[in-house]
């Protein structure tokens, strides 16, 4: 039962994270939560950074600055994949949840 619950939590978190990405950066509250998660967990996007390419409000040459290894204003524009976190947040945060929840 514990494994079923854990999988459900992960699935729910994945859906919720992707949903929040759709609102980025229009919703300031959502943006700050996602930015905090990406910066703190050193991750980018749900599965990986290319998830940001699918967000209509984000140009394909851009990821949030919080994806950058060294976060500075504007570092996510014309980014180089070598300078951003490549791991997705669902897997990264999911691992933390599995250990701690």
């Amino acid at each position: 039962a514990g494994y079923v619950f854990r999988d459900k939590v992960m699935s729910e978190f994945n859906n919720n994270f992707r949903q929040q990405m759709e609102n980025y950066p229009k919703n300031n509250h959502t943006a700050s939560i996602l930015d905090r998660m990406q910066a703190d967990f050193k991750c980018c996007g749900a599965a990986n950074y290319t998830d940001w390419e699918k967000i209509p409000s984000m140009s394909k040459n851009r990821v949030p600055d919080s994806c950058c290894i060294n976060v500075t204003v504007g570092c996510g524009i014309n980014f180089n994949e070598k300078a951003i976190h490549k791991e997705g947040c669902v897997e990264k945060i999911g691992g933390w949840l599995r250990k701690n929840v």
Partner: antibody, heavy 118, light 111 residues
Framework: EVKLVESGGGLVQPGGSLKLSCATS????????MSWVRQTPEKRLEWVAY????????YYSDTVKGQFTISRDNAKNTLYLQMSRLKSEDTAMYYC????????????WGQGTLVTIS | DIVLTQSPASLAVSLGQRATISCRAS??????????MNWYQQKPGQPPKVLIY???KLESGVPARFSGSGSGTDFTLNIHPVEEEDAATYYC?????????FGGGTKLEIK
């Protein structure tokens, strides 16, 4: 000294294919995103495509999407542009260029290779 | 796509005078405190060469007589004092989003 040398251009019939190459030297090729830009006979510049440093991500202008394929071989320090189903509108001088991170300027360009569709 | 409109299409300036070229974007190219506008010079038979990036930063090795200004949608390239070797075509280009686009060019003639 940074050098970019394009090759592979020529005269092709409409509907034909061509593969352009851009041999580079003088910098760590695998560290940079690379672009193809073309210049029409009327001298208009048009960004065509760019590719990420690893080659894992590619981006195209709507005018060439599904028709052109950008790729790279980091072991050979070479950039490629595979062009298919060529049309007269694709007649242009094709340049490869190095894109700089963050500001997106194109700092180094090759001398270009001419593609004529006729 | 962001459309860049350059004006004038051509201009003739006397040696030692000021040349001013404008570039207007159909949408703001400024974000995060930066303006993603670049300027290039192209001489016949040569590829374009970057002069100015991020609207006002001078590319290494480019003479200080070249300067760029502007933000949002309106940008300017100034050349002062103009020298013989500045006869060329000048292009603006934005790198704010994909696709990158270029202006139609301004041909500078030295009188």
């Amino acid at each position: 000294e940074v050098k970019l040398v394009e090759s592979g251009g020529g005269l092709v019939q409409p509907g034909g294919s061509l593969k352009l190459s851009c041999a580079t030297s003088g910098f760590t090729f695998s560290d940079y995103y690379m672009s193809w830009v073309r210049q029409t006979p009327e001298k208009r510049l048009e960004w065509v495509a760019y590719i990420s440093s690893s080659g894992g991500s590619t981006y195209y202008s709507d005018t060439v999407k599904g028709q052109f394929t950008i790729s790279r071989d980091n072991a050979k320090n070479t950039l490629y542009l595979q062009m298919s189903r060529l049309k007269s509108e694709d007649t242009a001088m094709y340049y490869c260029a190095r894109r700089e991170d963050y500001d997106g300027r194109l700092t180094y360009w090759g001398q270009g290779t001419l593609v004529t569709i006729s | 796509d962001i459309v860049l409109t350059q004006s004038p299409a051509s201009l003739a300036v006397s040696l030692g005078q000021r040349a001013t070229i404008s570039c207007r974007a159909s949408k703001s190219v400024s974000t995060s405190g930066y303006s993603y506008m670049n300027w290039y010079q192209q001489k016949p038979g040569q590829p374009p060469k970057v002069l100015i990036y991020l609207a006002s930063k001078l590319e290494s090795g480019v003479p200080a007589r070249f300067s760029g200004s502007g933000s949002g949608t309106d940008f300017t390239l100034n050349i002062h004092p103009v020298e013989e070797e500045d006869a060329a075509t000048y292009y603006c280009q934005h790198s704010r989003e994909l696709p990158y686009t270029f202006g139609g060019g301004t041909k500078l003639e030295i009188k």
